[in-house]
């Protein structure tokens, strides 16, 4: 099977149209959520089969898995199918909807499960929480699947931030059904430690009376034995834990730690493993890119986010123009650094109702005793354009002039247009654009000034009209990245009285 584009992951724009093609030596078909969407199937002269799936007017709800498979009953040798995952980042869609049965997760053993909360944008940071808790749980997240790990019988929700609003998923309920088979879970106080620090691992088994724990670990293979401690936890019956404690870890202690548990009554056994990394010294690493120029719109709130990895936990400081920032009492600035997994952090600077004065040079610095990293960017405050003045005058030269003045950030573009038939314009007749072309009896002169204190551009444009023989509606439109504004004036011939 050949899929075009090949993926395996695509990020597409909302409202766009996209074409997926799959071809193979036998009839092929596209599948989406176990259904076959409308598609065009064809057979080429060379015997190749193809199917074209056209996705139109994409929304966030089109996010998900797409499969191309062979579509015949001859039962080909290979059960081949190609998987493609499409993201359609859509700020209007929070978490993708789940079927009711996906919200209830039943288990008969302690096993890894997935809480299937998914978002439309692979760049979003998603965190998992107990339903009644604020603390993010250190569980790995896959944007295509959700959070995977070993979960207690509790209720969980996922959270993400889209723009400046926090979005919660539906609640997911995990129920463990008691069975007598042996179930082991292994966790570590930390899976990353510096040399000289301690490694502490815990292996837990619930519901079995007589169990034997056996650990295998890197140090054991070199003949250096560590004696585990068995602890009978007292919160519920038969909650037994083996603790393996390695003081003063060395680089050679990195590797896989396996706990094998056997119970003699039914001769059941289970084992679980965990990887431990011993690093020479701590680290801080930026994840992803943050552009050196960032934008915020005047009077809107803006959150600037930096994602990084660090061990041990770092101190995070934000600076503006080399001055340290802190949460302001007036609530204009909010700083937060969240630990989204054991070594992953998200630091956010939120500017509430942005002011012009908040433009400038921002730096985030994350550091501890072993390492530091800093990230800087310039914040530009975008101001929607507004036309401040549109006036007409009759100089002695006989020509008529119209002057338009406006401001905005980034620099506004100016568009002049005119309409000669006042009765039909602009509803029935589109206005004519005016400019410096030789055909038009008009000339333009535009000056741009940057006002440092207000941090915005002022545009002054003068339109010279050579001879006006009947009333003319002249419109000045200013446009920039964050808006547009228009004013119009009626210009009458010299000979006509007002």
């Amino acid at each position: 099977l050949v899929v075009t584009p090949p993926g395996p992951e695509l990020v597409l724009n909302v409202s766009s149209t996209f074409v997926l093609t799959c071809s193979g030596s036998a009839p092929v078909v596209w599948e989406r959520m176990s259904q076959e969407p409308p598609q065009e199937m064809a057979k080429a002269q060379d015997g190749t089969f193809s199917s074209v799936l056209t996705l139109t007017n994409l929304t966030g709800l089109d996010t998900g898995e797409y499969f191309c498979t062979h579509n015949d009953s001859r039962g080909l040798e290979t059960d081949e199918r190609k998987r493609l995952y499409i993201f359609v980042p859509d700020p209007t869609v929070g978490f993708l909807p789940n079927d009711a049965e996906e919200l209830f997760i039943f288990l008969t053993e302690i096993t890894e499960i997935t809480i299937p909360c998914r978002v439309t944008d692979p760049q979003l940071v998603v965190t998992l929480h107990e339903k009644k808790g604020d603390v993010a749980l250190p569980v790995p997240y896959d944007h295509q699947r959700g959070f995977s790990g070993i979960f207690e019988d509790r209720s969980y929700i996922c959270k993400t931030t889209i723009g400046d609003r926090e979005v919660d998923s539906d609640a997911y309920y995990v129920y463990r059904l008691q069975v007598s088979s042996i179930n082991v879970s292994v966790n570590a106080v930390q899976t990353v430690v510096r040399q000289g620090e301690n490694i502490t691992l815990m292996c837990i088994v619930i519901g079995n009376e007589v169990v034997n724990f056996e650990w295998t670990y890197p140090r054991k293979e070199s003949g250096r034995l560590v004696e585990p401690v068995t602890d009978f936890l007292l919160d519920m019956p038969y909650h037994i834990r083996s603790i393996l404690h390695i003081p003063s870890a060395e680089l050679e202690d990195s590797g896989t730690y396996t706990c094998n548990v056997t119970e003699s009554v039914n001769d059941h056994q289970d084992e679980k493993a965990i990887n431990i990394t011993v690093v020479e010294s701590g680290y801080v690493r930026l994840l992803g890119e943050v552009g050196t120029l960032q934008f915020a719109e005047l009077h809107r709130s803006r959150t600037l986010q930096v994602v990084f990895e660090a061990y041990p936990p770092p101190t995070v400081l934000w600076f503006k123009d080399n001055r340290t920032l802190g949460d302001s009492s007036a609530g204009e600035i909010a700083l937060s650094t969240r630990n989204v997994s054991e070594t992953r952090y998200v630091s956010e600077l939120t500017l509430v109702r942005v002011k012009v004065a908040e433009a400038g040079h921002y730096t985030m610095r994350a550091f501890h005793e072993d390492a530091e990293v800093q990230l800087s960017f310039q914040l530009q405050i975008n101001v929607p354009v507004r036309v401040l003045e549109l006036s007409e005058s009759h100089p002695d030269s006989g020509e008529q002039t119209v002057r338009c003045r406006g401001r905005g950030m980034p620099q506004p573009n100016i568009i002049w247009s005119a309409c000669r038939d006042l009765k039909r314009c602009p509803r029935e007749l589109p206005p004519t654009l005016l400019g410096n072309s030789s055909e038009e009896e008009s000339q333009l002169e535009t000056n741009v000034t940057y006002w440092e204190e207000e941090q915005e551009f002022e545009v002054v444009s003068t339109l010279r009209l050579q001879h006006v023989d009947r009333p003319l509606s002249v419109r000045c439109t200013l446009r920039n990245a964050v808006g547009q504004d228009t004013q119009e004036v009626i210009v009458v011939p010299h000979s006509l009285p007002f």
Epitope: D231, F232, L234, M236
Partner: antibody, heavy 119, light 106 residues
Framework: EVQLVESGGGLVQPGGSLRLSCAAS????????MAWVRQAPGKGLEWVAS????????YYRDSVKGRFTISRDNAKNTQYLQMNSLRAEDTAVYFC????????????WGQGTMVTVSS | DIQMTQSPSSLSASVGDRVTITCQAS??????IAWYQLKPGKAPRLLMR???TLESGTPSRFSGSGSGRDYTFTISSLQPEDIATYYC????????FGGGTKVEIK
Amino acid sequence: EVQLVESGGGLVQPGGSLRLSCAASGFTFSNYGMAWVRQAPGKGLEWVASITNSGGNTYYRDSVKGRFTISRDNAKNTQYLQMNSLRAEDTAVYFCARHTPGANYFDYWGQGTMVTVSS
Amino acid sequence: DIQMTQSPSSLSASVGDRVTITCQASQSIKNYIAWYQLKPGKAPRLLMRYTSTLESGTPSRFSGSGSGRDYTFTISSLQPEDIATYYCVQYANLYTFGGGTKVEIK
């Protein structure tokens, strides 16, 4: 023969502190979780706190959390209950009890020591 | 937290009578209930665990039954040495005692 002997009870003023001890013998102390259970005059039994055999985990009833600390010294075959910020309602006979490994019910108890909190 | 409601709080019976005490949990305790006998000035004594398993040394006139939330403790033929206060305790999730039942002889 399993034996648990409590000591350290007495009269103390509200807000004061007291440290109870429980000396264990007749079994391998480090293999067993231990607990404190109390009985106020004319009232029923009430679980107070427990500690795992290694001392790695402790558990408390809500009304004593932050005020009482359970601990143990496996080398001395002794468990302790440090009681701070004592209140009149903490007046009771305090029993030392042993947890059976795994199932966790209390299988052996001491005779108890009386703690009176009064001004 | 799991609550345990024990009844009656006291009872008076004749030697040889059948005596029944009940304990109800606020949620299922999966048979994790034990029964203790407490006599003044003595250490509490474990009689029965896991609903119906008698401890060694507990006379066979004592028995237990129940499941889910509801449990019963029975003395089939009351003896003078059985005069005491009896307590149930759940150990399914931490520990909660019932209020106790004082057994007296008429």
